[in-house]
Interface confidence: medium
């Protein structure tokens, strides 16, 4: 024997007190699929989270985060506070980027510059806080008679200066 | 149901004292990380302070720093915000959040937030 309850479609919910009629999902809740015994409740986004996309009786909510904020998580399920691009969040809020280290999102944690010299590179533009190193041609390229261009001065290794 | 739920706004001298709490419910308080928000009118939400789960870490923004002071009882599963010396510019609405467990890699992220309370500093 056919479930009657799989006839009902996204939308409704099988009502047992109803003789498993397929009844609309009440206000603020929905049912993705068919054949569901319940609606689930909408998900609300309150606080620092805004709507992105409302709920309607097949579809949940979805949130994303106020200005300031980006999303993490599965669906997100948190919102984490931005930084300015050269900093990363910490426990004591955002912190410049230590020597030797840069980021050049809102989010995220700094990462170390590219060493250069593991490709057998040089440095063309030094790095910032903002912005990794830019490796030019080996110094091999670089030699008299291969290039009229003249190295820059090398970045300090990356090291970490106190904060 | 997850729910915080803050007090003890309202309107304040300059160089007057206020105390905001922040009551919790619906989850297991002394496992997560609490931060105070604030926001200005026409401003951007701002971090203002938070304390880890036994209250032994706690950091503000440099603006308030000396001033405020978040504390926290997992017993009565409250947030607190001691504000002294306030100035017009902490006008704002007051909100708590509840922040990281510390067992997840989106530890400065918030998921439940309060509904807020109001602060004015104005003479």
């Known amino acids: 024997l056919q479930d009657p309850c799989s006839n009902c479609p996204a939308g409704t919910f099988c009502d047992n007190n109803r003789n498993q009629i397929c009844s609309p999902c009440p206000p603020n809740s929905f049912s993705s699929a068919g054949g569901q015994r319940t609606c689930d409740i909408c998900r609300q986004c309150k606080g620092v989270f805004r709507t992105r996309k409302e709920c309607s009786s097949t579809s949940n909510a979805e949130c994303d985060c106020t200005p300031g904020f980006h999303c993490l998580g599965a669906g997100c399920s948190m919102c984490e506070q931005d930084c300015k691009q050269g900093q990363e969040l910490t426990k004591k809020g955002c912190k410049d980027c230590c020597f030797g280290t840069f980021n050049d999102q809102k989010r995220g944690i700094c990462r170390p510059w590219t060493n250069c010299s593991l490709d057998g590179k040089s440095v063309l533009v030094n790095g910032t806080k903002e912005r990794d190193v830019v490796c030019g041609p080996s110094p091999a390229d670089l030699s008299p008679g291969a290039s009229s261009v003249t190295p820059p001065a090398p970045a300090r290794e990356p090291g970490h200066s106190p904060q | 149901e997850v729910q915080l739920v803050e007090s003890g706004g309202g309107l304040v001298q300059p160089g007057g004292s206020l105390r905001l709490s922040c009551a919790a419910s619906g989850f297991t308080f002394s496992n997560y990380w609490m931060i105070w928000y604030r926001q200005a009118p026409g401003e951007e939400l701002e971090w203002v302070a938070n304390?880890?789960?036994?209250?032994?870490?706690?950091y503000y923004v440099d603006s308030v720093k000396g001033r405020f002071t978040i504390s926290r009882d997992n017993a009565t599963n409250s947030l607190f915000l001691q504000m002294n010396s306030l100035r017009a510019e902490d006008t704002a609405v007051y909100y708590c959040?509840?922040?990281?467990?510390?067992?997840?890699?989106?530890?400065?992220?918030?998921?439940?937030w309060g509904q807020g309370t109001t602060v004015t500093v104005s003479s």
């Open positions: 959040a509840r922040g990281g467990d510390g067992y997840s890699n989106s530890h400065y992220g918030m998921d439940v």
């Open positions: 304390i880890n789960q036994d209250g032994s870490e706690k």
